[in-house]
Interface confidence: low
C-alpha cells in the first residue's frame, strides 16, 4: 500500500496585512480514515488554527468543500491577515480513533506578513537653540514587516549625514519599529527651514512616507540692538530710538531705563515678518532734556524668549543742550552691544 503523503507545496507565502492568505495542503490518499487539522508552530506548544470537526474559527475557511466524498484538498484561507498571524503553518493528518492519532505532518508553510510602516512622526528638541548649535530631531515609525527598511533625513531637500538609526527588535518578530536621530547644525537663516524624515519600505510600492518638522520650533535667533538719537526738537525733547533686529521667535520684551530707573516696558506683538522669517522692532523714547540737570544715561534692555537681558546704553549730554536753544548735537554712545551666548 502506498504511503500517505501530506503535501504543502509552498515553503513560504508572503501576504499584505489586511489581505487573505491561502495555505495549500493536499493528501495523496483517502486512507487511512481520519481528520486533517491545521496548526501554527510545531511541538507541544503548537496552536490549533483549523479543525473541520469542531471549534469556531471565524477567519479560517476551507478552500474546497471538505465534507465531499473523495476530497483530498484541505487548503485553507485565512482572512484579514495581521502581523500577529506570521509563523509556520502545518497541515497534519490524523488516524481516526479514540483518541485520534497523529499520522503525518506536511513540511510546513511559513507565512510572512507585509505590513506598512506607520506615518513617520518627527519630534524636535524640547528647548530652542541658537545658530551654530546642534539640535537633534527624532523620527519614529512602527508596525512594519518585513524588517528591511530605509530611512533618510533631509534638510531643505539636502540629505543629512549625521544620523543614527535603529530597527527593533533585533531578532525575529511579527512587526518592527524604526527610530532615527538626526543632528542638525542651526544657522540664523533656518527659521523657514524644514527637516523631513523619509521612510521607504517594500509595502509602499516606491512611494515613501514622510514626516516633517519645522526648524522654526527649534531655533532662537537673538536680536541685534542699535540705539540712535534723532535731532533735538524745538521743545528741548530728544527722540531716542532702539532698533531690535533679526530676532526669532517674536516673544520679546523691551524696557527703557533712565539713569537705571524703569521708564517704560513694551511687549512685541503682531510684527511683520522679514523674508528670512525673523522680526524687527523699533521703540522710541522722548527725553525732556530741560528736566535734567546732569547727563542722562539711557538703557534699552531687551529680554528675548525668556533669555537673560541684552542691554545697550548711552548718555545724552545735557551740557551740550543749552536750555534756551534747540541744538542738534548728537548723543554720545557709551554703550556696547552686550550679547549673551546661550
Amino acid at each position: 500500500e502506498e504511503e500517505l503523503q501530506v503535501i504543502q507545496p509552498e515553503k513560504s507565502v508572503s501576504v499584505a496585512a489586511g489581505d487573505s492568505a491561502t495555505l495549500n495542503c493536499t493528501v495523496s490518499s483517502l486512507i487511512p480514515v481520519g481528520p486533517i487539522q491545521w496548526f501554527r508552530g510545531a511541538g507541544p506548544g503548537r496552536e490549533l488554527i483549523y479543525n473541520l470537526k469542531e471549534g469556531h474559527f471565524p477567519r479560517v475557511t476551507p478552500v474546497s468543500d471538505p465534507t465531499k466524498r473523495n476530497n483530498m484538498d484541505f487548503s485553507i484561507r485565512i482572512s484579514n491577515i495581521t502581523p500577529a498571524d506570521a509563523g509556520t503553518y502545518y497541515c497534519v493528518k490524523f488516524r481516526k480513533g479514540s483518541p485520534d492519532v497523529e499520522l503525518k505532518s506536511g513540511a510546513g508553510t511559513e507565512l510572512s506578513v507585509r505590513a506598512k510602516p506607520s506615518a513617520p512622526v518627527v519630534s524636535g528638541p524640547a528647548v530652542r537653540a541658537t545658530a551654530e548649535h546642534t539640535v537633534s530631531f527624532t523620527c519614529e515609525s512602527h508596525g512594519f514587516s518585513p524588517r528591511d527598511i530605509t530611512l533618510k533625513w533631509f534638510k531643505n531637500g539636502n540629505e543629512l549625514s549625521d544620523v543614527q538609526t535603529n530597527v527593533d527588535p533585533a531578532g525575529k518578530s511579527v512587526s518592527y519599529s524604526i527610530r532615527s536621530t538626526a543632528r542638525v547644525v542651526l544657522t540664523r537663516r533656518d527659521v523657514h527651514s524644514q527637516v523631513i524624515c523619509e521612510v521607504a519600505h517594500v509595502t509602499l510600492q516606491g512611494d515613501p512616507l514622510r514626516g516633517t518638522a519645522n526648524l522654526s520650533e527649534a531655533i532662537r535667533v537673538p536680536p541685534f540692538l542699535e540705539v540712535t538719537q534723532q535731532s533735538m526738537r524745538a521743545d528741548n525733547q530728544v527722540n531716542v530710538t532702539c532698533q531690535v533686529t533679526k530676532f526669532y521667535p517674536q516673544r520679546l520684551q523691551l524696557t527703557w531705563l533712565e539713569n537705571g530707573n524703569v521708564s517704560r516696558t513694551e511687549m512685541a506683538s503682531a510684527l511683520p515678518e522679514n523674508k528670512d522669517g525673523t522680526y524687527n522692532w523699533t521703540s522710541w523714547l522722548l527725553v525732556n532734556v530741560s528736566a535734567h540737570r546732569d547727563d542722562v544715561k539711557l538703557t534699552c534692555q531687551v529680554e528675548h524668549d525668556g533669555q537673560p537681558a541684552v542691554n545697550k546704553s548711552f548718555s545724552v549730554k545735557v551740557s551740550a543742550h543749552p536750555k534756551e536753544q534747540g541744538s542738534n548735537t548728537a548723543a554720545e554712545n557709551t554703550g556696547t552691544n552686550e550679547r549673551n551666548i546661550y
Epitope: A17, K116, S118, A119, L204, Q205, D207, L209
Partner: antibody
Framework: QIQLVQSGSELKKPGASVKVSCKAS????????MNWVRQAPGQGLEWMGF????????TYAQGFKGRFVFSLDTSVSTAYLQISSLKAEDTAVYYC????????????????WGQGTLVTVSS | DIQMTQSPSSLSASVGDRVTITCRAS??????LAWYQQKPGKSPKALIF???YRYIGVPSRFSGSGSGTDFTLTISNLQPEDFATYYC?????????FGQGTKLEIK
C-alpha cells in the same frame, strides 16, 4: 506653502449638476489621497470618500454612490467633485482635504483642508 | 459603521481655564484618531493625529490622549482664539467617521 484652493459658491436648481474643483499647490497632488467632506448647514462633518490620486481610483462612502463622482486632472493638480440630479438636501459646504497618502490602508487624518465650497440647491 | 460620540455637546469656559473633551468610539479604533478645530465660516484645522501627536504649529496647550475606544482632547490655559467647535474622527475603518462636535463657548 501647501494650499488647497476650491472653486466659488454655486446656486443651482433641483435636477441640475455642479462641479466643484480643488486645486492643490505646494506639494505633488499624486503623493496624497484627496478626500471630500460634506457639512450641511449647522451640522457636523460627513466623509464622502476619497480618490487615489496616483491611480485615479475613487472610493465612495455608502450614502454617496451614484450621483457623486470624484475625478482628477493631475496636469493642473486639481481634484473635482461632480454632483448630478441635485436635490435640496445636497445644500451644504463641500470640503476637499488631503490625507498622508494613498498607500495608507486607513486613509489617515486630514492634515490640510480647502476653504470649502457652498453649494445651494433651491428652486 | 463606527459611531463616534463626543461629550459634552457644548461647554462654557473662561480664558485661562483647562477643558477636556471626550470622544468614544463604538468599537476599537486603536490610535487611529484625529482631532480638528473649526471656527464659524471656516474650514476645519487639524490639531492632533494618531490620538496624541500634535501637528506642526499647534500650540502645546492642546494635548490628546487615549487608545482603543476612549479618547480625550485637553486644552490647558484656554486662549480667546480657542473658542470654536471641536471634532474627533476615526480613521481605523472605512467609512471614516466624525464625532458630532463639541462647541466651546466663552463664559
Amino acid at each position: 506653502q501647501i494650499q488647497l484652493v476650491q472653486s466659488g459658491s454655486e446656486l443651482k436648481k433641483p435636477g441640475a449638476s455642479v462641479k466643484v474643483s480643488c486645486k492643490a499647490s505646494g506639494y505633488s497632488i499624486t503623493d496624497y489621497a484627496m478626500n471630500w467632506v460634506r457639512q450641511a448647514p449647522g451640522q457636523g462633518l460627513e466623509w464622502m470618500g476619497f480618490i487615489n490620486t496616483y491611480t485615479g481610483e475613487p472610493t465612495y462612502a455608502q450614502g454617496f454612490k451614484g450621483r457623486f463622482v470624484f475625478s482628477l486632472d493631475t496636469s493642473v493638480s486639481t481634484a473635482y467633485l461632480q454632483i448630478s440630479s441635485l436635490k435640496a438636501e445636497d445644500t451644504a459646504v463641500y470640503y476637499c482635504a488631503r490625507t498622508r497618502g494613498y498607500y495608507d490602508f486607513d486613509g489617515g487624518a486630514f492634515d490640510y483642508w480647502g476653504q470649502g465650497t457652498l453649494v445651494t440647491v433651491s428652486s | 459603521d463606527i459611531q463616534m460620540t463626543q461629550s459634552p455637546s457644548s461647554l462654557s469656559a473662561s480664558v485661562g481655564d483647562r477643558v477636556t473633551i471626550t470622544c468614544r468610539a463604538s468599537q476599537n479604533v486603536g490610535t487611529h484618531l484625529a482631532w480638528y478645530q473649526q471656527k464659524p465660516g471656516k474650514s476645519p484645522k487639524a490639531l492632533i493625529f494618531s490620538a496624541i501627536y500634535r501637528y506642526i504649529g499647534v500650540p502645546s496647550r492642546f494635548s490628546g490622549s487615549g487608545s482603543g475606544t476612549d479618547f480625550t482632547l485637553t486644552i490647558s490655559n484656554l486662549q480667546p482664539e480657542d473658542f470654536a467647535t471641536y471634532y474627533c474622527q476615526q480613521y481605523n475603518t472605512y467609512p471614516l467617521t466624525f464625532g458630532q462636535g463639541t462647541k466651546l463657548e466663552i463664559k
